[in-house]
């Protein structure tokens, strides 16, 4: 029950996190005009990963896309890439985790397969969250650097060279959304990995009880089987979590890699 809850909660937390990463990536407020010197500005600038916007006091908002790839700073391209990778990994992780959920039965999928999928999705969520956190942090670092570097900039206008104080930008709402969303995805991924441990078949040493007619000997076979009856080879290879006594035809599985997560 605890495993199902942990897995379900991990899934929900990751889902919220990935939705947040998508929202942050699409948001225009990655950087917003610093209003420290002019708190009552008539023109307010803000920028996203894909376009920059200007909101006037009149209420009119104008957004312009970055219609160039080569002309954009490498750091911005890197942030875009990190966020997209985060979204893609997160989306795949969500898809995998849906099938891995213990509460959902799909055919005769074994618990070991579900454990594998849970671990895979968990790792994907962790990497997705890290990508988002890294992307947002790189952008934030870029903002901090530019903030202190922005003194005066020269623009060429119709009237010749014009001296203008460069607009300074500070952290926008998208950065905080991205940090929180990345953190949630990361937490969700960790929860999935924890749930995976509970899902994985455990290596338990049960005493094999052999019921046989007199005259039949108990044959001990190699390969991890504790005991087997003499009535032919044992083909049953499923593990039943019934919590009760197990007969010798309930085969003990090999320890899997999930036991060491």
């Amino acid at each position: 029950m605890a495993v199902t809850a942990c897995q379900g909660l991990g899934f929900v937390v990751s889902l919220i996190g990935i939705a947040g990463i998508i929202a942050a990536t699409c948001m225009d407020q990655w950087s917003t005009q610093d209003l420290y010197n002019n708190p009552v500005t008539a023109v307010f600038n803000y920028q996203g990963l894909w376009r920059s916007c200007v909101r006037e006091s009149s209420g009119f908002t104008e957004c312009r896309g970055y219609f160039t790839l080569l002309g954009l700073p490498a750091m911005l391209q890197a942030v875009r890439a990190l966020m997209i990778v985060g979204i893609v990994l997160g989306a795949i992780g969500l898809l995998v985790s849906i099938f891995a959920l213990k509460c959902i039965r799909i055919g005769s999928m074994e618990d070991s397969a579900k454990a594998n999928m849970t671990l895979t999705s968990g790792i994907m969520f962790i990497v997705s969250g890290l990508c988002a956190i890294a992307g947002v942090s790189v952008f934030a670092n870029m903002l901090v650097t530019n903030f202190w570097m922005s003194t005066a900039n020269m623009y060429t206008g119709m009237g010749g060279m014009v001296q203008t104080v460069q607009t300074r930008y500070t952290f926008g709402a998208a950065l905080f959304v991205g940090w929180v969303a990345g953190g949630l995805t990361l937490i969700g991924g960790v929860m999935m990995c924890i749930a995976c441990r509970g899902l994985a078949p455990e290596e338990t040493n049960y005493k094999a009880v052999s019921y046989h007619a007199s005259g039949h000997s108990v044959a001990y076979k190699p390969g991890g089987f504790k005991a087997s009856t003499g009535f032919g080879s044992n083909t049953k290879n499923k593990k039943i979590y019934d919590g009760g006594a197990r007969t010798e035809d309930e085969v003990q599985s090999y320890p899997s890699k999930h036991d060491y997560v």
Epitope: Q33, N38, V40, T41, A42, V43, N45, Y46, Q47, S52, C53, V54, E56, S57, S58, G59, F60, E62, R64, N153, Y155, G157, V162, Q163, T164, V165, Q166, T167
Partner: antibody, heavy 118, light 113 residues
Framework: QIQLVQSGSELKKPGASVKVSCKAS????????MNWVRQAPGQGLEWMGW????????TYAEDFKGRFVFSLDTSVATAYLQITSLKAEDTAVYYC???????????WGQGTLVTVSS | DIVMTQSPDSLAVSLGERATINCKSS????????????LTWYQQKPGQPPKLLIY???TRESGVPDRFSGSGSGTDFTLTISSLQAEDLAVYYC?????????FGQGTKLEIK
């Protein structure tokens, strides 16, 4: 079409108060900021301030802080300018004007002449 | 506050001739975010309220004749009337729309020579 219709001329004594109204039609008052501009006889235009459409929060130019109050009554789509403790130098034509794209004043009222004389 | 200075204070031009009015701002009106200059031109005829002519320094308001044009960037701006008509006789004002308080130039009176 968009129209801003202001109240009629006022003759007041020094120390009195006056309330100029500006009724908007042809658009939703709460979607656009309303500005107030003063023009003394034979003089240029002076921006007095504006009132934000969504919050109704007024912003005043430095020379118009204190005795000047902007307000909105959205139920009757009307903006108001109230001037208290009138002085002779307040004699002017007062205009209301809608704030539009480019932070421009695209539609103006016809103006209200306020004369302060003893 | 941004100070707007117009020149000349008055201008006499013959009908059909070109009229040029200048406006200089004490601070830059070019917004780096959208590369637009927040300068507006108004025309005021006697006994009438001002009328919007040009915004963003060079964008004509709808209904304004194309003989009116605006140019300039940063701190120096120009309003040009390519061929003066009798109905163009008025006072012209430039206005800063970049930062509060919005400020107007002192006005340029355009007269017939």
């Amino acid at each position: 079409q968009i129209q801003l219709v202001q109240s009629g001329s006022e003759l007041k004594k020094p120390g009195a108060s006056v309330k100029v109204s500006c009724k908007a039609s042809g658009y939703t008052l709460t979607n656009y900021g309303m500005n107030w501009v003063r023009q003394a006889p034979g003089q240029g235009l002076e921006w007095m301030g504006w009132i934000r459409p969504n919050t109704g929060e007024p912003t005043y130019a430095e020379d118009f802080k204190g005795r000047f109050v902007f307000s909105l009554d959205t139920s009757v789509a009307t903006a108001y300018l109230q001037i208290t403790s009138l002085k002779a130098e307040d004699t002017a034509v007062y205009y209301c004007a809608r704030l539009y794209r480019g932070n421009t004043l695209d539609n103006w009222g016809q103006g209200t002449l306020v004369t302060v004389s003893s | 506050d941004i100070v707007m200075t117009q020149s000349p204070d008055s201008l006499a031009v013959s009908l059909g001739e070109r009229a040029t009015i200048n406006c200089k701002s004490s601070q830059n009106l070019l917004n780096s975010g959208n590369q637009r200059n927040y300068l507006t031109w108004y025309q005021q005829k006697p006994g009438q309220p001002p009328k919007l002519l040009i915004y963003w320094a060079s964008t004509r308001e709808s209904g304004v004749p194309d003989r009116f044009s605006g140019s300039g960037s940063g701190t120096d701006f120009t309003l040009t009337i390519s061929s003066l008509q009798a109905e163009d006789l008025a006072v012209y004002y430039c206005q800063n729309g970049y930062s509060f308080p919005f400020t107007f130039g002192q006005g340029t009176k355009l007269e017939i020579k």
